[in-house]
Interface confidence: low
């Protein structure tokens, strides 16, 4: 656990010609505030995707009124840091979005109005516990200068805030099996209290209360042995191979969204759609009013000032959602043909075509195998002016990129359990049945024999993550 801290140093006109007009005037005094959004990894996700690492709003800055005839100076800033707490390990790489917002203090109906002045974004590598990193970003004619750092909250230390430390009980050395906590040599690594019952031989934990298994062991307490070859069974004479992508529990299992929020899975985590009056990654924060600035992307907030009243965001063109947080998805009209990937660049739509297709909307079929890639060992077959991929066992789809699920048709009879494997499927039969598909009852004399399982996977072996 720890905190990402952002210090805004200045926001004002950038160098060069074309200085921006001051955002405030004598008729419309205003003040600034900032919003920061953090995401793990070096993702180039859209601005409206969830801030999976966290987000924060600054306080409002001092009220500013433009002096007539004066050029726009650096604008007065809010006091203090923007702090984004993170509960898990610091990922080491992150993407950030920093938005500069203007709060107009004129006589608007329904209270003050907010508008987005500037948005900057970037991707950075940063070790927790390091010094402040300085940065300058430009958005149009505006320039934002800021510093940031990630620091661990005690007892966590390290570049990812994953090691736990505590002060020494004895002045000279740490307890048995515990190391000094460099660079805090006067502290010792704290023994982790793993989940109750976690196997001391085969389990370990990196955070209190968890139980993670060493290779070859599985189960909630790491007490169940698994085959050491189930993931790395031979595909050829000399290569270690694959086959470990099995469905795990989904991010939405158990519904992590509080207060009636609905959960939808995203490629790396989950996203909560919150009912009105709640917000936050898990809809855990309540009592939102217009004073909290909940409308993004220039949305106008209308609502009462008391905590119990709802608010409504009136979104500008191109945005939607209860907080104007979603860009209108022009790709939902599926303009890209033949499976092309649609990219909404804001100013234009672009189609990224699959192999074998070309054109602005991927409408041209190149109609041969030249340059066509069939994934996962598939081979391209021409014929009749068209082409197709003949896929290796266990894969399907136009380019053999889809992992076929041989268990989808429930091929194991008599209650047998089906396991997907890169060479096909394996049935683990219920007691009393045998055969490749558990189709034969066991004879009383036990005369029949079960056909051999594919190499490297025994019937009943669960696959595992590495």
């Amino acid at each position: 656990a720890g905190v990402f801290e952002l210090q805004i140093h200045s926001f004002g006109p950038g160098p060069g010609p074309g200085a921006p007009r001051s955002p405030c005037s004598a008729r419309l005094p205003c003040r600034l505030f900032f919003r920061v959004c953090l995401k793990p990894g070096l993702s180039e996700e859209a601005a409206e995707s969830p801030c999976a690492l966290g987000a924060a709003l600054s306080a409002r800055g001092p009220v500013y009124t433009e002096q007539p005839g004066a050029p726009a100076p650096d604008l007065p800033l809010p006091d203090g840091l923007l702090q984004v707490p993170f509960r898990d390990a610091w990922p080491g790489t992150f993407s950030f979005i920093i938005e500069t917002w203007r709060e107009e203090l004129g006589d608007q109906i329904g209270g003050p109005a907010w508008s987005l002045l500037a948005r900057v974004a970037g991707r950075r590598r940063l070790a927790a516990g390091g010094p402040w990193a300085r940065d300058i970003q430009r958005a149009g004619a505006w320039e934002l200068r800021f510093s940031y750092r990630a620091r661990c909250e005690p007892p966590a230390v390290g570049t990812a805030c994953t090691r736990l430390c505590r002060p020494r009980s004895a002045p000279s050395r740490c307890g048995p099996g515990l190391r000094p906590c460099a660079p805090l040599e006067d502290e010792c690594e704290a023994p982790l209290v793993c989940r109750a019952g976690c196997s001391p031989e085969h389990g370990f934990c990196e955070q209190p209360g968890e139980c993670r298994c060493l290779e070859g062991w599985t189960g909630p307490l790491c007490t169940v042995p698994v085959s050491t070859s189930s993931c790395l069974s031979p595909r050829g004479p000399s290569s270690a191979t694959t086959g470990c992508l099995v469905p795990g529990p989904g991010p939405c299992d158990g519904n992590p969204c509080a207060n009636g929020g609905s959960c939808s899975e995203t490629p790396r985590s989950f996203e909560c759609t919150c009912p009105r009056g709640f917000y936050g990654l898990r809809c855990e924060v309540s009592g939102v009013t217009c004073a909290d600035g909940p409308c993004f992307n220039g949305g106008l907030c209308v609502g009462g000032a008391d905590p119990d009243s709802a608010y409504i965001c009136h979104c500008p063109p191109g945005f939607q959602g209860s907080n104007c947080e979603k860009r209108v998805d022009r790709c939902s009209l599926q303009p890209c043909r033949n499976g092309g990937l649609c990219l909404d660049l804001g100013h234009a739509l672009r189609c990224r075509c699959r192999a074998g297709f070309a054109g602005p909307r991927c409408e041209h079929d190149l109609d041969d195998c030249a340059g066509r890639a069939c994934a996962n060992g598939g081979t391209c077959v021409e014929g009749g002016g068209a082409h197709r991929c003949s896929c290796a066992l266990g894969f399907g789809g136009r380019d053999c990129r889809e992992r076929a699920d041989p268990c989808a048709a429930r091929p194991c009879a008599h209650g047998g359990r089906c396991y997907a494997h890169f060479s096909g499927l394996v049935c683990a039969c219920a007691p009393g049945y045998m055969g490749a598909r558990c189709e034969f009852p066991v004879h009383p004399d036990g005369a029949s024999a079960l056909p051999a399982a594919p190499p490297g996977l025994r019937p009943g072996d669960p696959q595992r993550y590495l």
Partner: nanobody, 126 residues
Framework: EVQLVESGGGLVQPGGSLRLSCAAS????????IGWVRRAPGKGEELVAR????????RYADSVKGRFTISADTSKNTAYLQMNSLRAEDTAVYYC???????????????????SGQGTLVTVSS
């Protein structure tokens, strides 16, 4: 096309050292976890070490802790396995293996093995 090419194997005496290299192409190792897997004659495979180049986080099998060190140079898109104090039981074919991000389940991020190289033979014998 994803490719992993191992090098640096060979014959070494007990107590000696070797450094294995894994040159990756067709993807950026920064976005993945890279591990070294070994297969010894008559034994199953063992994931001996792995690194997450994103933050330098490493894990080792108990059998090699303190003797092997995994590292990565993202500028060269290459991972390394420094093997010191080698023993006869370290004799095996060593494969470089890539794991891709598979999802965030419960409170953990999972990586699943999806590619490996052809391997390089390490023989420890006097």
């Amino acid at each position: 096309e994803v490719q992993l090419v191992e090098s640096g194997g060979g014959l070494v005496q007990p107590g000696g050292s070797l450094r294995l290299s894994c040159a990756a192409s067709g993807f950026n190792i920064y976005d993945h976890s890279i591990g070294w897997v070994r297969r010894a004659p008559g034994k199953g495979e063992e994931l001996v070490a792995r690194i997450y180049p994103t933050n330098g986080y490493t894990r080792y099998a108990d059998s090699v802790k303190g003797r092997f060190t995994i590292s990565a140079d993202t500028s060269k898109n290459t991972a390394y396995l420094q093997m010191n104090s080698l023993r006869a039981e370290d004799t095996a074919v060593y494969y470089c293996a890539r794991s891709s991000y598979s999802g965030y389940y419960g409170s953990h991020h999972y990586y699943a093995l999806d590619y490996s190289g052809q391997g390089t033979l390490v023989t420890v014998s006097s």
